[in-house]
């Protein structure tokens, strides 16, 4: 090896060099000095470095590793935020125009109901909205909530409208009477089942997004140990001290070093791998009965199908209310009333199946392929560092932390630095507690995302087949796949314009509101804008 | 006539356990989310539990989570708060309240004339 | 969770007006939750006078009103009768569902 070059006989470069980084000369000595008190660029001759020096190294090099790790993580970070914000608030859209499809439906089909039903409906969606951004609301209480509240309006309004004032106080009677007698038929379960199964798969996306941004945000923001700091000192700065200031460090020693800086970090790759592959597994299966979307736009469908139900049955219905509730006053008000075989729908209720076109669906599988782009994130940093900062090309005339060498030797390397710092001893350590905490959570999300992960092929579970609908029935190239009254299935050609209609807000009165009867053929309203054909929720 | 009508209250050591119940009548109770508010002498109101329609989401204020239990059996029409290690800064008349609505919080339409528990050696 | 930040008194004569104010935070009232406003007259349990911010139960007079924006909400009392001397709490829930009150008006008509 070559002895290594005369240092600069008055530390002149260096000088200037460390100027930069503390302005002010006290600390660097004007000519080279033996250098006893140095504890990490330890000299093999004079040495153009102060003790003061070597800490201001130290501080520098953790500093220059924190921002190196942040621009390594911008590209993924704004990836991962920018997609969480969109898809919140594209949910939310969705949300207000499921509202709004629904308001619209009781507006044009059944106008006496209104404005109790706007207030019913307004106080579910807000539920919705809420369970989406992770309030602890249960899903059938919420659908229970939404029909106990709209019998008692559809009973003394559409089915009993003579009723005199005074007979208002059967409310109470009515709620009770429209779980006990079943009055909407199946259809409340089947909303449960819909929304309760989109609705966590949404939440779980949505949490899953998030957790990538804290992801990011802990491993962005990590502060390395001093043991770190010096090893990155000697590999940046050390040979400054002998006065080498055009030298670069071997690529191959800065990659022995950055394993060493981010073995804690690294650690995270494993579940990180799994986190991406898990919410791609969340996102294939999220169609049908699990795309939020595609459930909730169709739900006005389903809501107009059960009152039509409950119509349907009114003869029925009113004479065992009138029965049930004549003297309400005396009535115990609890479930405890199931007449034989009342009403039981076996009707063929096939689920919603939506259009997509640029919808949320295909925005949701564009993010995914992007982030596989990143599935080696984490076991790729070390390298990714080495290639951003400044490293010899091919690993000659180079810096190994001790001295200039043609050809770097991790073996030599690490001999060199036996006495000076243990490499080995820093990778088993194990990764920080902020680390190791996210790792929990990861681990977490990881698990939840599997247990979510729909099975290929299946719309309905089994437990609805009991219950007397069919499951299955919607093939991929049906249109015609909402609701089921028979009088003309309602097809939804979604096609919510993603980003710009995520400027758009919508009230109920810019819902279709053309009050006259439509056959289905006539349900095609180029309406909403930029929604494109969006079928009208007429009858 | 819609009631509301709270048992259970009284004189009990720190520490201790204490169950109050309260009996609902006039309505359908299973439709409704239920609440026990608390209110020390001469303090302002202080929720304290809630339960949904069905019994499937509770919820609980800071000072009282891991040591009180909401529940509902709406065969019986009647909500419970079970009190567990008991403390003085618990002393209060905790009312028993109806939701207007079923799902979770929102107004409570409908109170008791409530229990007076107090904690104290 | 942190209560709502009321007034702790307020007073008026008869036929005067009384208006009190309830302020929470973005994620309480100024989230897409409802304000409601309770009556209470000592050793008494509390009334629903106002839910969904704005709407009275029946039975409850007009002259109790209720309206929100933003972060607060406030309770108006027009036309102010002995009657309505009491202790009045404003309430909403956080994102979490809890349920949040405020540390009670007491109301004085003079």
């Known amino acids: 090896q070559p002895p290594p070059p005369p240092p600069d006989a008055t530390c002149h470069q260096v000088r200037s060099f460390f100027q930069r980084l503390q302005p002010g000369l006290k600390w660097v000595p004007e000519t080279p000095v033996p250098g006893s008190d140095l504890q990490v660029c330890l000299p093999k001759g004079p040495t153009c470095c102060s003790r003061k020096m070597e800490e201001k190294y130290q501080l520098t090099a953790r500093l220059n590793m924190e921002q190196l790790l942040q621009s390594a993580s911008m590209e993924l970070k704004f990836l991962i935020i920018q997609n969480a914000a969109v898809f919140q608030e594209a949910f939310e859209i969705v949300v207000r125009h499921a509202k709004n499809y629904t308001n619209a439906m009781f507006k044009n089909n059944y106008p006496s109901l209104t404005p109790q039903a706007f207030e019913f409906v307004g106080e579910f969606f807000t539920d919705v909205s809420l369970y989406i951004l992770g309030s602890d609301i249960n899903v059938d209480d919420m659908v229970n909530e939404l029909f106990d509240s709209l019998f008692p309006v559809i009973y003394t309004q559409l089915m009993n409208p003579g009723l005199p004032d005074s007979a208002l106080d059967i409310n109470e009677c009515l709620r009770g009477a429209r779980r006990d007698l079943k009055v909407f038929g199946n259809f409340p379960k089947l909303i449960m089942t819909q929304v309760s199964k989109s609705l966590q798969v949404t939440r779980i996306f949505l949490q899953a997004l998030n957790l990538g941004i804290e992801v990011i945000n802990t491993t962005d923001h990590l502060k390395f140990s001093k043991d770190c700091g010096r090893m990155l000192t000697r590999m940046w700065y050390c040979s400054y001290c002998q006065g080498l200031m055009m030298v670069k460090p071997c690529g191959g020693y800065c990659n022995v070093v950055m394993q060493g800086c981010m073995a804690g970090v690294v650690e995270i790759d494993k579940y990180w791998r799994e986190y991406i592959l898990s919410l791609e597994e969340l996102v294939n299966g999220m169609y049908r009965i699990y795309d939020m979307e595609n459930v909730l736009l169709g739900l006005f469908s389903t809501i107009h199908d059960s009152i039509q139900y409950v119509q349907k049955n009114a003869g029925k219905l009113t004479t065992t209310i009138g029965k049930l509730c004549a003297h309400s006053q005396q009535r115990q008000y609890r479930s405890a009333y199931y007449p034989e075989d009342l009403f039981i729908d076996k009707k063929v209720l096939k689920v919603a199946h939506v259009e997509h076109e640029e919808t949320l669906s295909s925005r949701r599988r564009e993010l995914i392929q992007k982030l596989k782009s990143f599935i080696s994130f984490y076991s790729a940093l070390p390298g990714y560092i080495c290639s951003h900062s400044p490293v010899a090309e091919n690993d000659t005339l180079c810096w190994n932390g001790q001295e200039l060498v043609e050809r770097y030797s991790q073996k030599a390397a690490r001999n060199g630095m036996k006495n000076q710092f243990n490499l080995h001893e820093l990778k088993m350590k194990g990764p920080e507690p902020v680390v190791s905490q996210i790792i929990d959570k990861l681990k977490h999300i990881n698990q939840l995302l599997r247990t979510m992960s729909m099975p290929k092929g299946r719309v309905l579970d089994k437990n609805l087949d009991e219950e007397g609908f069919e499951s299955g029935d919607c093939g991929d190239d049906e249109d015609e796949c909402i609701g089921g009254s028979g009088d003309g299935m309602i097809k939804v050609k979604n096609q919510l314009r993603f980003l710009a209609e995520l400027a758009y807000d919508l009230d109920v009165d810019d819902a279709p509101g053309n009050s006259q009867q439509a056959t289905p053929k006539d349900n095609e309203i180029s309406t909403f804008h930029n929604l494109g054909n969006v079928h009208s929720p007429l009858k | 006539q819609v009631q509301l009508q709270e048992s259970g209250g009284g004189l009990v050591q720190p520490g201790r356990s204490l169950r109050l119940s309260c009996a609902a009548s006039?309505?359908?109770?299973?439709?409704?989310?239920m609440h026990w508010v608390r209110q020390a002498p001469g303090k302002g109101l202080e929720w304290v539990s809630a339960?949904?329609?069905?019994?499937?989401?509770?919820y609980y204020a800071d000072s009282v989570k891991g040591r009180f239990t909401i529940s509902r059996d709406n065969s019986k029409n009647t909500l419970y708060l079970q009190m567990n290690s008991l403390r003085a800064e618990d002393t209060a008349v905790y009312y028993c309240?109806?939701?207007?609505?079923?799902?979770?919080?929102?107004?409570?339409?409908?109170w008791g004339q409530g229990t007076l528990v107090t904690v104290s050696s | 969770q942190s209560a709502l930040t009321q007034p702790p008194s307020a007073s008026g004569s008869p036929g005067q007006s009384v208006t009190i104010s309830c302020t929470g935070t973005?994620?309480?009232?100024?989230?897409?939750?409802?304000v409601s406003w309770y009556q209470q007259y000592p050793g008494k349990a509390p009334k629903l006078l106002i839910y969904?911010?704005?709407s009275r139960p029946s039975g409850v007079p007009d002259r109790f009103s209720g309206s929100k924006s933003g972060t607060s909400a406030s309770l108006a009392i027009t036309g102010l009768q002995a009657e309505d001397g009491a202790d009045y709490y404003c309430?909403?829930?956080?994102?979490?569902?809890?349920?949040?009150f405020g540390g009670g008006t007491k109301v004085t008509v003079l």
């Open positions: 309240a109806k939701d207007r609505r079923g799902s979770h919080a929102d107004a409570f339409d409908v």
């Open positions: 006039g309505f359908t109770f299973s439709s409704y989310a």
């Open positions: 339960i949904s329609s069905s019994g499937g989401s509770t």
């Open positions: 973005s994620s309480d009232v100024g989230l897409m939750h409802n």
């Open positions: 969904k911010s704005s």
């Open positions: 309430q909403s829930y956080d994102s979490s569902l809890r349920v949040v």
